[in-house]
Amino acid sequence: QTSVFPPEVILPRGGSVKVNCSASCDQPISLGMETPLPKKEILPGGNNWKMYELSNVQEDSQPMCYSNCPDGQSSAKTLLTVYWTPERVELAPLPPWQPVGKNLTLRCQVEGGAPRANLTVMLLRGEKELSRQSAVGEPAEVTTTVPVGRDDHGANFSCRTELDLRPYVLKLFENTSAPHQLQTFDLPATPPQLVSPQVLEVDTQGTVVCSLDGLFPVSEAQVSLALGDQKLNPTITYGNNSLSAKASVKVTAEEEGTQQLLCGVMLGNQTQETRQTVTIYSFPAPNVNLTKPEVSEGTEVIVECEAHPRAKVMLNGVPAQPPGPRAQFLLKATPEDNGRSFSCSATLEVAGQLVHKNQTRELRVLYGPRLDEKDCPGNWTWPENSQQTPMCQAWGNPLPQLKCLKDGTFPLPIGQSVTVTRDLEGTYLCQARSTRGEVTREVTVNVLSPRYE
């Protein structure tokens, strides 16, 4: 009977081990070891035993001890199990962006490592174990699928191997891959909301607002706003899960016509777009022409209004007959027309919308000067010592200057409160004078003395 000790050995790869071979008889005819491993007999041995040192053990092996005793030949094997940690533990790259709500497949590759029976592969989120599997195959590949939520954004995923050699060598060997950070995103299926004018006038400023709710992470979202070939430069305001991009747009005559307004919100590797048609139009204000802006009373004045060829005009609220871009009327200027406004309103249909433009011109009518009985009475009779305010209003454009003088020497205080005295009595010559000429009117002041009452 041949014996071997130790019957089982676990050792690190490239390690050495001492193995004792012994025979059951006292004087074996032969005693030895058969192994492909480099071996060295450790002397001195005994009559019925030998000690060998096996070195550079690279893989599992079963060296065999044999003995030849008088009663027969026998052999015994020792089981050498080599252990080593994996040479490569690698988590497959994660997608640059992972949509929220979509399952994520984690894949880990393990190269090397033995004994495989004692090698476990774990997939981790941070330090939390998601899956634990045995390492099978070379390289071993372990996968697991996990649902992804918003709280996974920025989470670290890794792969860890455990070589558990307990209770043999009372050791647990761990190898961990480089962590991979997950970027999750949530872009709703609804397109952005785009608020913009449907029609925009050349050389005017319009405001475009593009907004979208339900974005995650909102700070990573990008917005693209463009009107035709013109890229807009929006100011972006971020909410909790929403964003609003506001841009000013000014269009030129070259862009006249129908243009596409595009708003795109990009998040992760996805884009949501909204398109809208904007009609760009040119519509100058109508022209109001007066044959002369300043005329003398009695002059005939032609008031003419002309607008865009496709517009319809109204002059002082009266539509052109027939409806069209021109309207005119004739008037004989009266003092009442002085300062009168002539307003032309033009209406143009653009993309089903009515747009309006107004222009106003004022007529100046030169008239007077005038001194009428109504505004400058020819006779006043006042009690002596009473308080009176002489009133005399001259009319005209330009506004006339007025003076009332008695005998060219005594002025009558027009519009001022006076105490009536005998000196005030008499006939005053009131003169109204402007660049258009001069009119005069006599005004008589009678003073009633108390003794005549």
Partner: antibody
């Protein structure tokens, strides 16, 4: 339109003197004419006025000492009995009471009267 | 009587400065107050009529105000050319008058 005074000269006290204001470019029937004097180194002193109707009005101190009269183109100021205190430059003024402004406030260059024995 | 009292009799003012001349009528002359500027050897120059209206060609630094019995002439941003004697005149009554003119204010520019 202009006004110009004449007749200023050296007179002995008590010798009556008439100053004449000749107007051109306007009618005296529609304008009042006044007389103002200024003694050497002194202020302006109002003497009197003749209205467009021909009525005359005098400063209280001037009554009896001066007489204002007019023809169609001239206005006269008569110093009835001059004294040395009447030595002054005498100005003729058109419309001193008109409130249309400086187009009517027309002053002559003045004429110097010297009363001395 | 409708007479005018003017103050001060003389005033000294620096170039760029402001001067205020006052006139008081013995009774209300409403707004009928005129102001004149006179330089030595020259006839009076008409400045202001109806208390506050500027005669044509008169710079806006001359300002008249007041009504009734109290009137003021203010000259701001004085220039050396403004050195003269200034007179107020009541232009309301041509009778019952002792003197229609104020006594005058000599303005000396430093």
């Amino acid at each position: 339109q202009s006004v110009e005074e004449s007749g200023g000269r050296l007179v002995t006290p008590g010798t009556p003197l008439t100053l004449t204001c000749t107007v051109s470019g306007f009618s005296l029937s529609s304008h009042a004419m006044g007389w103002v004097r200024q003694a050497p180194g002194k202020g302006l002193q109002y003497i009197g006025i003749i209205g467009s109707s021909g009525s005359t009005y005098y400063a209280s101190w001037a009554k009896g000492r001066f007489t204002i009269s007019k023809t169609s183109t001239t206005v006269d100021l008569r110093l009835t009995s001059p004294t040395t205190e009447d030595t002054a430059t005498y100005f003729c003024v058109r419309d001193p009471y008109d409130s249309f402004g400086d187009a009517y406030r027309l002053w002559g260059p003045g004429t110097l009267v010297t009363v001395s024995s | 009587a409708y007479d005018m009292t003017q103050t001060p009799a003389s005033v000294e003012v620096a170039v760029g400065g402001t001067v205020t001349i006052k006139c008081q009528a013995s009774q209300s002359i409403y707004s009928y107050c005129s102001w004149y500027q006179q330089k030595p050897g020259q006839r009076p120059k008409f400045l202001i009529y109806d208390a506050s209206k500027l005669a044509s060609g008169v710079p806006s630094r001359f300002k008249g105000s007041g009504s009734g019995t109290e009137f003021t002439l203010t000259i701001s941003g004085m220039q050396s050319d403004d050195a003269a004697t200034y007179y107020c005149q009541q232009a309301y009554s041509s009778s019952n008058v002792d003197n229609a003119f104020g006594g005058g204010t000599e303005v000396v520019v430093k």
